[in-house]
């Protein structure tokens, strides 16, 4: 098992978290991806992409939007209107099967504090465990998609065993696979 060091992302309430999860194209371009939050030692899948298609559509679950760009080997995650209670540990994973998922990269430790909203200030980026002071510029995000249709995801599973090639880690007890509305 490879131990992954978490990255700390510090935001203010009302801000938007935008994350870039990159993956190996040759391995995972056609796989489903998911965004999960660790609750204790239990990962909770908050949203996951549809089955691969030629034209992938964004998936929106409440304040979370996922968009997979398989040509580019990138998953885009947006969490809008952050709240203090959103604080916690998050991960992008490759969702290949309820009993096998792969963590894509270092977990994100999201810290949301009360205060005026803005975007994180830009400075030399660091690799791990660095706090950033947000600037005062607000990140405006309007509603992105309309005309929802609902896709029922796989039923809940009690455990997920994560294999560990490269920078991936073992997880257990992944729960709460949820119904995901998909927006065209």
């Amino acid at each position: 098992t490879t131990e992954l060091t978490e990255e700390k992302y510090e935001y203010k309430e009302g801000q938007t978290l935008e994350v870039k999860c990159d993956y190996a194209l040759e391995k995972y371009a056609n796989s489903r991806k998911a965004w999960q939050k660790m609750e204790g030692k239990m990962p909770k899948i908050l949203a996951k992409t549809e089955r691969p298609s030629e034209n992938s559509h964004p998936v929106q679950v409440g304040r979370i939007t996922l968009e997979d760009y398989p040509d580019h080997g990138l998953l885009q995650v947006r969490m809008t209107n952050l709240q203090v209670e959103d604080s916690g540990l998050y991960q992008c994973v490759i969702y290949q099967h309820p009993k096998e998922s792969h963590v894509l990269f270092n977990p994100i430790c999201l810290v949301v504090t009360k205060g005026s909203s803005g975007t994180p200030g830009s400075s030399e980026n660091s690799t791990q465990n660095v706090y950033r002071t947000p600037s005062t510029t607000a990140k405006a995000l309007g509603p992105r998609y309309t005309s929802p249709r609902t896709v029922t995801q796989a039923p809940p599973e009690s455990t997920v065993v994560v294999s560990t090639p490269g920078s991936e880690i073992n997880l257990t007890n992944v729960t709460d696979i949820i119904r995901v509305p998909v927006f065209n």
């Epitope: 990255e7 992302y9 935008e18 994350v19 870039k20 999860c21 990159d22 993956y23 190996a24 194209l25 968009e67 760009y69 040509d71 580019h72 080997g73 990138l74 885009q76 995650v77 947006r78 990269f105 270092n106 994100i108 975007t119 994180p120 200030g121 830009s122 400075s123 030399e124 980026n125 660091s126 690799t127 950033r132 510029t137 990140k139 405006a140 995000l141 309007g142 992105r144 490269g166 920078s167």
Partner: antibody
Framework: QVQLVQSGAEVKKPGASVKVSCKAS????????INWVRQATGQGLEWMGW????????GYVKKFQGRVTMTRNTSISTAYMELSSLRSEDTAVYYC?????????????????WGRGTLVTVSS | DTQMTQSPSSLSASEGDRVTITCQAS??????LNWYQEKPGKAPKLLIY???NLETGVPSRFSGSGSGTDYTFTISSLQPEDIATYYC?????????FGGGTKVEIK
């Protein structure tokens, strides 16, 4: 000094391949994605794709898929962009550019550091 | 792909004039927009990031604004050293795309 130093100009025949290098110095090479952008004479800027120097993951614009390969050698802090099956319309200045982000995994695509460009001329 | 329509393609103004360049995206890009300056024979230089943030070391006469699909870049008082081509670049959606450029000259 923080900089990206690119290899020199190249003249190639149609159908050939070219490999442009981009050597980083003054910062931790593996902490920033490297992107490649090209500019044909008298034309605008065109993004070709990106590479994560840490893991070697890459992503290419559809237009270039199958012809472009982005690689790196972390021991010498150098990124490479190889373009094959060259045609006359590939004649351009090719830039490598560093993607700055507040956090390593932020969805931010600010190119705050650029190489000086490598002119690739494709002519029979 | 998100198309970026930049206008005008060229302009000529006097020193001290206020210069405005616009960029319109074919879809919402959520303020995910940068502005670059390119001088002949030199690499592009980042001026404004995320629609309105001034890059460190860039003179305050440069500014950016906008939201949704419409964005504006302004030089409040044109200087001779500002003669260059300016490009917008969106990153709200992939692939990243640039505007066609605006060549700024001094009368």
């Amino acid at each position: 000094q923080v900089q990206l130093v690119q290899s020199g100009a190249e003249v190639k025949k149609p159908g050939a391949s070219v490999k442009v290098s981009c050597k980083a110095s003054g910062y931790t090479f593996t902490s920033y994605d490297i992107n490649w952008v090209r500019q044909a004479t008298g034309q605008g800027l065109e993004w070709m794709g990106w590479m994560n120097p840490n893991r070697g993951n890459t992503g290419y614009v559809k237009k270039f898929q199958g012809r472009v390969t982005m690689t790196r050698n972390t021991s010498i802090s150098t990124a490479y962009m190889e373009l094959s099956s060259l045609r006359s319309e590939d004649t351009a200045v090719y830039y490598c550019a560093r993607r700055r982000a507040v956090y390593r995994s932020s969805w931010e695509w600010y190119f705050d550091l650029w190489g000086r460009g490598t002119l690739v001329t494709v002519s029979s | 792909d998100t198309q970026m329509t930049q206008s005008p393609s060229s302009l000529s103004a006097s020193e001290g004039d206020r210069v405005t360049i616009t960029c319109q995206a074919s879809q919402d890009i959520f303020n995910d927009l940068n502005w670059y300056q390119e001088k002949p024979g030199k690499a592009p230089k980042l001026l404004i990031y995320h629609a309105s943030n001034l890059e460190t070391g860039v003179p305050s006469r440069f500014s950016g604004s906008g939201s949704g699909t419409d964005y504006t870049f302004t030089i409040s008082s044109l200087q001779p050293e500002d003669i260059a081509t300016y490009y917008c670049q969106q990153y709200g959606n992939l692939p990243l795309t640039f505007g066609g450029g605006t060549k700024v000259e001094i009368k």
